[in-house]
């Protein structure tokens, strides 16, 4: 169902933790005092905080942190990861019997853990699979018409256009927009071969299509993926979006009357993965050495020799499947209708140990530990914790997006954060994170509290870490939460600088994972501790741990970007005054809210709820109200995709400087006006009631 983006950030290195930056949302980071914990009971105790107030609060947070740590120490993560990699659950393509069987296992485990409530959502969605009879095929067509078979690949790309094409074959490196722009030859009317990595399959195909290629072959080259097995098969999908592409923008519950429609993110050209051995066979018929700057192995060649063509046949077929999303909730004691969602993909095309096994194992263990903490250790989260096991993640976060689509109008008022556990353990060297800026302060404090599983040093090593955070990308389940639903989301991993080579392949097994990461249990424990501390801080504290002040710097850097184009804007007879004013209003609204919080009576549940409600709306209001969620599902002006985004506005201005004839001034005027009003809307939402809002604007 939705449109596309990829994940990561660095914090790296050694040393001990340092002090973190402040920020609006960090005020309530330390847990409650005894009096606060009693707030809202029959006779609330109201105390003025004394000198020892901070110490008492810290103690309680330390208590919870210690409890979590003790539980983590006695948890066998690898046992569960291994169990999920047994043939009883492998392979578990979405909607299959083994996927459903694992869903039932997760559901039963949630019940055994005595969660407050366990339930399931069922969706009927369309995926694309290989035809059971006709084979996908790559062939070299010689000048005399003879066919030289290259491969009938075991892997495939879901949502490819099922068709047959023939033409010249050219290499386009990773298939990024920049790669295509820098090619010395045209791809128009040709098939392109690209290597996996850097961007998603969907983006590669969309880029190739925009440069008029007629088909795409994707392979894993030896440099980026140093895998011994040259014949290793690869799977992925090419939907430039998330969710069921045949019910774009609306949920596919069985009772929905489906209007016949399809996502604009579906490709119009065929795409197929091939093994490295097949790619090398093709290179044997090609000429021209690949540029050194590509940093690619020497077998790489650029263009198919004259008088030869490549024929690609894709016979994939659509299949309607029933998928199950499994949920379990630990109900909050104060605001049960507000919840943090912790989720993981369950399905996998192959064995999926790193792809979905680790995340599902983490999900199960976190549910078990938190339920235990509530039932036995006296943890009383103010807000609820929902644990979600999604299906059809391999086809573009389908299960997660369907859930979001089903509750689009209300979810942002209830779910205030999404924590993604997918691919949380892919290595040991780095800790990387991608998230909404609203979560940066929480992340920083967590990094100062969690030690690296191997070095033993705190994860927080770099005070400048936030500037290196990469945007959430479309292949990350956290992306639709943030960009489609306006719910702050975070995704993180322990990983290497290089890609984990087995994702989406038949070698994504427990055996390979434990071989590459012998300390797997320790690393999984650290990942669970990161997620666990997020959960505690988000559900336990009086104030929501969402740092609304973080968007001030994002807005400021956007204004700086725009300032480079002052002359262009003046030439069009436009002014940035209103945008400055909207940004100023946002800044003032954040300052006012911080003051309101400091002055608020923390034990007054109603006052605190009013403040939290304002904080909760921030992310959602960054969704452009001027575009349809059906046509442009990813409406977030910072993190979404489409002409309504701030980056699209800046790109349009760049175009004016580069090629004024290609510049669309009407579009730009609209972009500027709508961006201004969207930002003003966020400021207004943060300010609270309408009578508190200045309307000099």
């Amino acid at each position: 169902h939705h449109h596309h983006h990829h994940h990561h950030h660095h914090s790296g290195g050694g040393g001990s933790g340092g002090g973190g930056s402040g920020g609006g949302g960090s005020k309530g980071v330390e847990p409650k005092t005894e009096s606060e914990r009693l707030a809202g009971t029959e006779s609330p105790v109201r105390e003025e905080p004394g000198e020892d107030f901070p110490a008492a609060r810290r103690l309680y947070w330390d208590d919870l942190k210690r409890k979590l740590s003790e539980k983590l120490d006695s948890t066998d993560f690898t046992g569960t990861i291994k169990l999920l990699n047994e043939n009883s659950y492998v392979p578990r393509e979405a909607g299959s019997q083994k996927d459903e069987n694992l869903a039932l296992y997760v559901e039963n485990q949630f019940r055994e853990f005595k969660l407050s409530k366990v339930w399931r959502d069922q969706h009927f969605v369309k995926i694309q699979v290989k035809d059971s009879i006709g084979q996908n095929m790559v062939t070299i067509v010689q000048s005399n018409g003879n066919l030289d078979p290259v491969e009938s690949p075991e892997g495939y790309v879901a949502f490819s256009k099922p068709t047959e094409v023939s033409g010249k074959l050219v290499h386009a490196n990773f298939g990024t927009k920049k790669d295509f722009e820098e090619l010395s030859y045209s791809v128009n009317g040709s098939l392109v071969i690209v290597r996996a990595g850097e961007i998603t399959f969907a983006e590669k195909v969309a880029n190739a299509q925009s440069f008029n290629a007629i088909g795409v072959l994707i392979y894993m080259d030896k440099n980026k993926f140093p895998v011994v097995e040259a014949d290793l098969a690869l799977f992925g999908h090419a939907h430039l979006g998330t969710g069921d592409p045949y019910t774009p923008g609306f949920p596919s519950f069985n009772h929905t009357q489906f209007p016949p429609s399809q996502s604009s993110g579906l490709p119009n050209i065929p795409v197929q993965t091939i093994s490295r051995a097949a790619a090398e066979k093709l290179f044997g018929k090609m000429e021209g050495s690949c540029p050194a700057r590509w940093n690619i192995d020497s077998s790489c060649k650029l263009e198919l020799s004259q008088n030869q063509n490549v024929k690609l046949i894709v016979k994939n077929v659509l299949k309607e499947i029933k998928i199950l999303n499994i949920f379990g909730v630990i109900k909050g004691f104060v605001e049960p209708d507000h919840y943090v969602v912790v989720g993981a993909q369950r399905d996998a095309w192959g064995p999926g140990a790193a792809k979905s096994g680790v995340g599902t194992a983490l999900l199960l263990k976190l549910a078990q530990m938190f339920s235990d903490m509530v039932l036995k250790d006296g943890f009383q989260p103010s807000r609820s914790i929902i644990f979600a096991s999604w299906s059809a993640g391999d086809f573009g976060s389908v299960g997660a997006t369907e859930w979001l689509e089903g509750y689009l109008s209300s979810l942002h008022l209830k779910a205030f954060t999404y924590i993604n556990l997918d691919k949380a353990v892919l290595g040991t060297s780095n800790f990387k994170v991608s998230a909404s800026p609203l979560l940066y302060t929480l992340i920083e404090k967590t990094m100062q509290n969690v030690k690296h599983p191997v070095t033993g040093q705190f994860l927080y090593q770099d005070s400048n870490w936030a500037s290196k955070v990469e945007k959430l990308t479309l292949d990350n389940a956290a992306f639709p939460f943030l960009a489609y639903s306006g719910i702050p989301a975070v995704s993180f991993c322990f990983c290497e600088d290089t890609d984990y080579p087995y994702l989406g392949t038949t070698m994504d097994t427990y055996k390979e994972l434990i071989e590459r990461i012998p300390e797997l249990n320790k690393v999984a424990r650290a990942a669970a501790e990161v997620a666990g501390q997020f959960v505690i801080k988000l559900t336990h504290d009086v104030e929501l741990n969402l740092d609304y002040e973080m968007y001030n710097s994002k807005l400021l850097s956007f204004m700086k970007d725009l300032n480079q184009f002052k002359t262009d804007i003046r030439d069009m007879g436009l002014s940035l005054q209103w945008l400055y004013s909207a940004r100023g209003d946002y800044f003032r609204a954040t300052s006012r809210l911080t003051t309101d919080f400091h002055n608020a009576e923390k034990t007054n549940r109603f006052v605190m709820r009013e403040i939290n409600d304002r904080i909760m709306k921030v992310e959602y209001h960054f969704l452009s109200p001027y575009v349809s969620p059906r046509e442009s599902p990813f409406r977030h002006i910072f993190w979404g995709s489409g002409s309504h985004t701030l980056s699209a506005l800046v790109e349009n201005l760049k175009l004016r400087q580069k090629n004024i004839t290609a510049f669309n001034e009407t579009l730009f005027r609209n972009q500027l006006a709508l961006a201004t009003w969207t930002i003003q809307g966020v400021a207004n939402a943060l300010s609270g009631d309408i009578w508190n809002i200045d309307n000099e604007f």
Epitope: N87, S88, V90, P91, G95, Q97, G350, P351, T506, Y510
Partner: antibody, heavy 121, light 113 residues
Amino acid sequence: EVQLQQFGAELVKPGTSVKISCKASGYTFTDYNMDWVKQGHGKGLEWIGDINPNYDTTSYSQKFKGKATLTVDKSSSTAYMELRSLTSEDTAVYYCARSEAGNYYWYFDVWGAGTTVTVSS
Amino acid sequence: DIVMSQSPSSLAVSVGEKVTMSCKSSQSLLYSSNRKNYLAWYRQKPGQSPKLLIYWASTRESGVPDRFTGSGSGTDFTLTISSVKAEDLAVYSCQQYYNYPYTFGGGTKLEIK
């Protein structure tokens, strides 16, 4: 013709291990799981476990975890089962059988002739 | 684990007679998504390895004579031999492949009078 070839008999001492083989022919080895089934003298059939030769993933019946280890050699299309810490209880005929590997559970359409393992001092 | 129970444990019939044997599972073997029953029947002649007769509870394996019929759904299944031949002397076992661990019934021994 699809065949699973097993070798007749093994006489082994208690406390030792034995590794029995099953050579597949006539089909694509990696398209099917290899299952192993035990049959004690005059007794019923007991499923031990299976291995997916494509992924090298396994599943074992709880009873045989720690007792049996399944492996494959793709280059020779041969599956192996090693039984360790043998006792008289392990005296039985062991069959290999194939079941389709995939997202669904499957029946055993081809069986080997069986290997008789006798544990005796 | 799913428990499979077969009855009778043995029976003796004359050539040409019709015979039925039963197999019950401790839980349903019907998978709702494809409406299939995950039950197979095998025949094991003396001194031989088992051979597949019926899968999906009622589908005959190719080469199996049509005197063999599988029926039933959910938890109750039956194997019927419409007219017994001398070569049918064997042990007949049912097996569930609905979920791991796969389990077999104790078998029904068919003897010829």
